[in-house]
Interface confidence: low
C-alpha cells in the first residue's frame, strides 16, 4: 500500500534552528525532529533527502511508519532506534538510499513491532551477521520482521570486504534463526552469482522471494521443497541457462507458486528438453510465452513454448584429434 502523502494540513515541520533549543530537554511526546515532517494522525515521520548523518534522537513515540530515505547515515550502530520509552509502535522503517555502508549487530533492537524494513540502495560493505537477530546466540528471540527489502545493497567492487557478499548477506538472514517468520524477502540487483544452498530451507514462512536482476547461473543446488507457502518467485534478469528436472518438480509441487523467468539467456540444446515439456504443461510460470532462446546462435529468439524435441539437439563432442583450435 502506498505511503501517506505529505500535505500542508496533515504534516508539521520542525525548523532547523529549533534543534539546539530542545536538545538539552527530554523530547516532548508529540514533538517533530528537526528536518523531518510528522503526522500524528497518520503515525508517520518523514526525514527524507535531508543529508542526516544519524538517526534523530527525538522521534515521537507514536511513530508507526518512519522514512529516513536519501540521507548520509553511513553507520547504523547497535540500538540505533532504542529509546526511552521505546518506539513500541514502529512497524515500517525505510532506510533506502541513505549511504549506509555498515549495519552493526543489534541495530534494530528494541523495536518490538518492526514488521517491514527496507535497506535498499545502500552499499552495505559490512552487514553484521547479527544485524537482524541482535545477539550471537545460536537461537535468538524471534524477530517480528515480516518483510525485508534488500534490493541493490551490493557495494562497489573496490569497497567489498575480502569475503563472499552472498555469504555475508545469508549469514545475517540465518543468524539465530531469528527470521523464521519472514514472509517477503527481496534481494534484487545484488550481483549474486549463487544462492547458498541452506538459505531457503531456514526461511520456511516465505511467501514472496525476489532474486531478479542478479547473476544466478544455476539453481541446481537450491531447494524450494520446504517453501510450501511460497506464492511468488522472481528470477527475471539473471543468467539462468536451463532449469533441471529436480528444480522443475520442486516448483510444480508448491501449491500457490507463481514463477517469473523473463530475460534469462536460455540455452536451447538437448538439456532444455525437460524444461520445454514442463513449460508446455505448467501454469506456474507467469508470461511463459515470452521466454526465448539466447543460445545457440541458430536458436536465438525462438520461443521456448514453440520448440519440439527435434529442435533441441546437442552437437556431438568430437574426439580431441578431430577438434579444431
Amino acid at each position: 500500500s502506498s505511503s501517506p502523502t505529505s500535505s500542508a494540513s496533515s504534516f508539521s515541520s520542525s525548523a532547523p534552528f529549533l534543534a539546539s533549543a530542545v536538545s538539552a530537554q527530554p523530547p516532548l511526546p508529540d514533538q517533530c525532529p528537526a528536518l523531518c515532517e510528522c503526522s500524528e494522525a497518520a503515525r508517520t515521520v518523514k526525514c527524507v533527502n535531508r543529508n542526516l548523518t544519524e538517526v534523530p534522537t527525538d522521534l515521537p513515540a507514536y511513530v508507526r511508519n518512519l522514512f529516513l530515505t536519501g540521507n548520509q547515515l553511513a553507520v547504523l550502530p547497535a540500538g540505533a532506534f532504542a529509546r526511552r520509552p521505546p518506539l513500541a509502535e514502529l512497524a515500517a522503517l525505510n532506510l533506502s538510499g541513505s549511504r549506509l555502508d555498515e549495519v552493526r549487530a543489534g541495530a534494530f533492537e528494541h523495536l518490538p513491532s518492526l514488521r517491514q524494513l527496507d535497506l535498499s540502495h545502500n552499499p552495505l560493505a559490512d552487514l553484521s551477521p547479527f544485524a537482524f537477530s541482535g545477539s550471537n546466540a545460536s537461537v535468538s528471540a524471534p524477530s517480528p520482521l515480516v518483510e525485508l527489502i534488500l534490493n541493490h545493497i551490493v557495494p562497489p567492487e573496490d569497497e567489498r570486504q575480502n569475503r563472499s557478499f552472498e555469504g555475508m548477506v545469508v549469514a545475517a538472514l540465518l543468524a539465530g534463526r531469528a527470521l523464521q517468520g519472514l514472509r517477503r524477502l527481496e534481494l534484487a540487483s545484488n550481483h549474486f552469482l549463487y544462492l547458498p544452498r541452506d538459505v531457503l530451507a531456514q526461511l520456511p514462512s516465505l511467501r514472496h522471494l525476489d532474486l531478479s536482476n542478479n547473476s544466478l547461473v544455476s539453481l541446481t543446488y537450491v531447494s524450494f521443497r520446504n517453501l510450501t507457502h511460497l506464492e511468488s518467485l522472481h528470477l527475471e534478469d539473471n543468467a539462468l541457462k536451463v532449469l533441471h528436472n529436480g528444480t522443475l518438480a520442486e516448483l510444480q509441487g508448491l501449491p500457490h507458486i507463481r514463477v517469473f523467468l523473463d530475460n534469462n539467456p536460455w540455452v536451447c540444446d538437448c538439456h532444455m528438453a525437460d524444461m520445454v515439456t514442463w513449460l508446455k504443461e505448467t501454469e506456474v510460470v507467469q508470461g511463459k510465452d515470452r521466454l526465448t532462446c539466447a543460445y545457440p546462435e541458430k536458436m536465438r529468439n525462438r520461443v521456448l513454448l514453440e520448440l519440439n524435441s527435434a529442435d533441441l539437439d546437442c552437437d556431438p563432442i568430437l574426439p580431441p584429434s578431430l577438434q579444431t583450435s
Epitope: D118, E186, S232, H234, E236, E283, G287
Partner: nanobody, 120 residues
C-alpha cells in the same frame, strides 16, 4: 491508475451461495494471473484461489476445493468467485489481488474488499 473493485458480498445462511465480482482497470487484465484472498476477523490473510491469464488453469486452497469456483471474463476485465455450500468459517473480507510486476512495493495490488458473512 490500477483499480480493483470487489462486489457481491453480503449476509447468507449456511449452505447458501454468493458470487463475488472484481472489476479491474488501469492495467492489461488479460495479461496477469489473478487471485482471491480472504481475511477473517482477527486472522491473517489466507489465499483462496488463483486463475491463470486465459483461465486455463485454476488452483484452490484445500478449505474451499469443490465448493468455490474462480473464473474470469477478459472481455469485461472482471474476475469472479462463485461460492457454494457456504460455511460459518467462510466469513471474511474477500479481496482480489493482481501481482503486476517483478518488483516492488507498489506492484502488488489489492481491492478494498467485500464482506461475506455466513450466519443463520
Amino acid at each position: 491508475e490500477v483499480q480493483l473493485v470487489e462486489s457481491g458480498g453480503g449476509l447468507v445462511q449456511p449452505g447458501g451461495s454468493l458470487r463475488l465480482s472484481c472489476a479491474a482497470s488501469g492495467f492489461t487484465f488479460s495479461s496477469y494471473a489473478m487471485s482471491w484472498v480472504r481475511q477473517a476477523p482477527g486472522k491473517e490473510r489466507e489465499w483462496v484461489a488463483s486463475i491463470t491469464t486465459a483461465g486455463g488453469s485454476t488452483r484452490y486452497a484445500d478449505s474451499v476445493k469443490g465448493r468455490f469456483t474462480i473464473s474470469r471474463d477478459n472481455a469485461k476485465n472482471t474476475l469472479y468467485l462463485q461460492m457454494n455450500s457456504l460455511r460459518a468459517e467462510d466469513t471474511a473480507v474477500y479481496y482480489c489481488n493482481a501481482e503486476l510486476g517483478p518488483r516492488r512495493l507498489g506492484m502488488d495490488y489489492w481491492g478494498q474488499g467485500t464482506l461475506v458473512t455466513v450466519s443463520s
